[in-house]
């Protein structure tokens, strides 16, 4: 039950913060114009990974694509890939991690399959996260670097006597919604390697071998103990044979969760 | 048509006060920010104040700050400017103006005009 | 604030010549943010309220006739009356747009010679 709610926790948490990392991805709100101790301008420019915007006071806005692919700086180029990446991993997560759902049945369909493709959910969902986070923060540091540069350089004389101001812009919505995102793809990750380490079965399926005892005949089937839902002791597994014949496959240790291919 | 009627303006008394009115129609006002632009008598144009369409932001030129308060009521199409502690420099044909949609913050329509005339 | 500097105060022009009013603005009035500049012109005409000619620096008002030419970008800029006609008679004005305070240039009244 652990597992199913742990599994189950990390698919919707992961499903949100994909949401969120697509969502940032399409927001033009990367950065914002900078309005503190700025002088007071009739127009708010904010600029996203794929267009730039400017809002008029007479609530006109007016937004234009960045049409250009090789004039772009490369850090954004980076900022976009990443997030690309991220989307696209998170969506093969997603698909991967729906077939793993341990309420959802197709088929007959083995624990041990299910439990891989929990893990492989889990780690695209992690990776997924990792990205956002690191296109989102790949972009703030830009910004801070920019932002620094500007300020330096806040007014530059133009001969002589002409002033032009610099915008400055500061971190946009879309920052904050990318690093939650991330943050939660990354936990529902977590929580989905978590789950497969419940799911996987406690034995390796070694094939039924026959051995005689002496004394009376005793069939070793394979499953010994039934998967539990944590590693460590578990007093109420049973053994499903009695006899006193003993092989070396009975004494193993648990397996991990490296065992199952 | 767009049409814009100020009203309020007269002979007042420095130190006395004075309520222009603005009244607007032809137009979804409650959609458009609106300006007041003064001019004295045979002078250039001074822009007072800006409303945006929901009230805020609301903007002054700094010499008016604390002396001008404008206003508007998008129920009664109208827009004021109420203009308290009046000097003898304040003379001058109030307008009141629309800032115009997608003309890069341009005003767009203006009044005819209300004189104000600030004299002992 | 903005200083906007326009010259001459005053121009006197033969109908159907070129009439040249410039704008000198204290701080570029080019947005990086679209590349556009916020500066408009107005006529005003006498015992009349201003009236919308050219925004954005160069582009036309609706119904404005195609005589008058609005140019310039960043600090200076130029309105010209490629031929002018007797109703052009007026006073012209340059406003900053994207600073505020708002303000407008002292004026170029224009006469015809």
């Known amino acids: 039950m652990a597992v199913t709610a742990c599994q189950g926790l990390g698919f919707v948490v992961s499903l949100i913060g994909i949401a969120g990392i697509i969502a940032a991805t399409c927001m033009d709100q990367w950065s914002t114009q900078d309005l503190y101790n700025n002088p007071v301008t009739a127009v708010f420019n904010y600029q996203g990974l794929w267009r730039s915007c400017v809002r008029e006071s007479s609530g006109f806005t007016e937004c234009r694509g960045y049409f250009t692919l090789l004039g772009l700086p490369a850090m954004l180029q980076a900022v976009r890939a990443l997030m690309i990446v991220g989307i696209v991993l998170g969506a093969i997560g997603l698909l991967v991690s729906i077939f793993a759902l341990k309420c959802i049945r197709i088929g007959s369909m083995e624990d041990s399959a299910k439990a891989n493709m929990t893990l492989t959910s889990g780690i695209m969902f992690i990776v997924s996260g990792l990205c956002a986070i690191a296109g989102v923060s790949v972009f703030a540091n830009m910004l801070v670097t920019n932002f620094w540069m500007s300020t330096a350089n806040m007014y530059t004389g133009m001969g002589g006597m002409v002033q032009t101001v610099q915008t400055r812009y500061t971190f946009g919505a879309a920052l904050f919604v990318g690093w939650v995102a991330g943050g939660l793809t990354l936990i529902g990750g977590v929580m989905m390697c978590i789950a497969c380490r419940g799911l996987a079965p406690e034995e390796t399926n070694y094939k039924a071998v026959s051995y005689h005892a002496s004394g009376h005949s005793v069939a070793y089937k394979p499953g010994g103990f039934k998967a539990s839902t944590g590693f460590g002791s578990n007093t109420k597994n049973k053994k499903i044979y009695d006899g006193g014949a003993r092989t070396e496959d009975e004494v193993q240790s648990y397996p991990s969760k490296h065992d199952y291919v | 048509e767009v049409q814009l009627v100020e009203s309020g303006g007269g002979l007042v008394q420095p130190g006395g006060s004075l309520r222009l009115s603005c009244a607007a129609s032809g137009f979804t006002f409650s959609s458009f920010g609106m300006h007041w632009v003064r001019q004295a008598p045979g002078k250039g144009l001074e822009w007072v104040s800006y409303?945006?369409?929901?009230?805020?932001?609301?903007y002054y030129v700094d010499k008016l700050k604390g002396r001008f308060t404008i206003s508007r009521d998008n129920a009664k199409n109208s827009l004021y400017l109420q203009m308290n502690s009046l000097r003898a420099e304040d003379t001058a044909v109030y307008y009141c103006?629309?800032?115009?949609?997608?003309?890069?913050?341009?005003?767009?329509?203006w009044g005819q005009g209300t004189l104000v005339t600030v004299s002992s | 604030d903005i200083v906007m500097t326009q010259s001459p105060d005053s121009l006197a022009v033969s109908l159907g010549e070129r009439a040249t009013i410039n704008c000198k603005s204290s701080?570029?009035?080019?947005?990086?943010?679209?590349?556009?500049?916020?500066l408009a012109w107005y006529q005003q005409k006498p015992g009349q309220p201003p009236k919308l000619l050219i925004y954005g620096a160069s582009t036309r008002e609706s119904g404005v006739p195609d005589r008058f030419i609005g140019s310039g970008s960043g600090t200076d800029f130029t309105l010209t009356i490629s031929s002018l006609q007797a109703e052009d008679v007026a006073v012209y004005f340059c406003?900053?747009?994207?600073?505020?305070?708002?303000?407008f240039g002292g004026g170029t009244k224009v006469e015809i010679k």
């Open positions: 406003q900053n747009d994207l600073f505020y305070p708002l303000t």
């Open positions: 701080q570029s009035l080019l947005n990086v943010g679209n590349q556009k500049n916020y």
């Open positions: 409303i945006s369409s929901g009230s805020s932001p609301i």
């Open positions: 103006a629309r800032a115009g949609y997608a003309v890069r913050n341009a005003l767009d329509y």
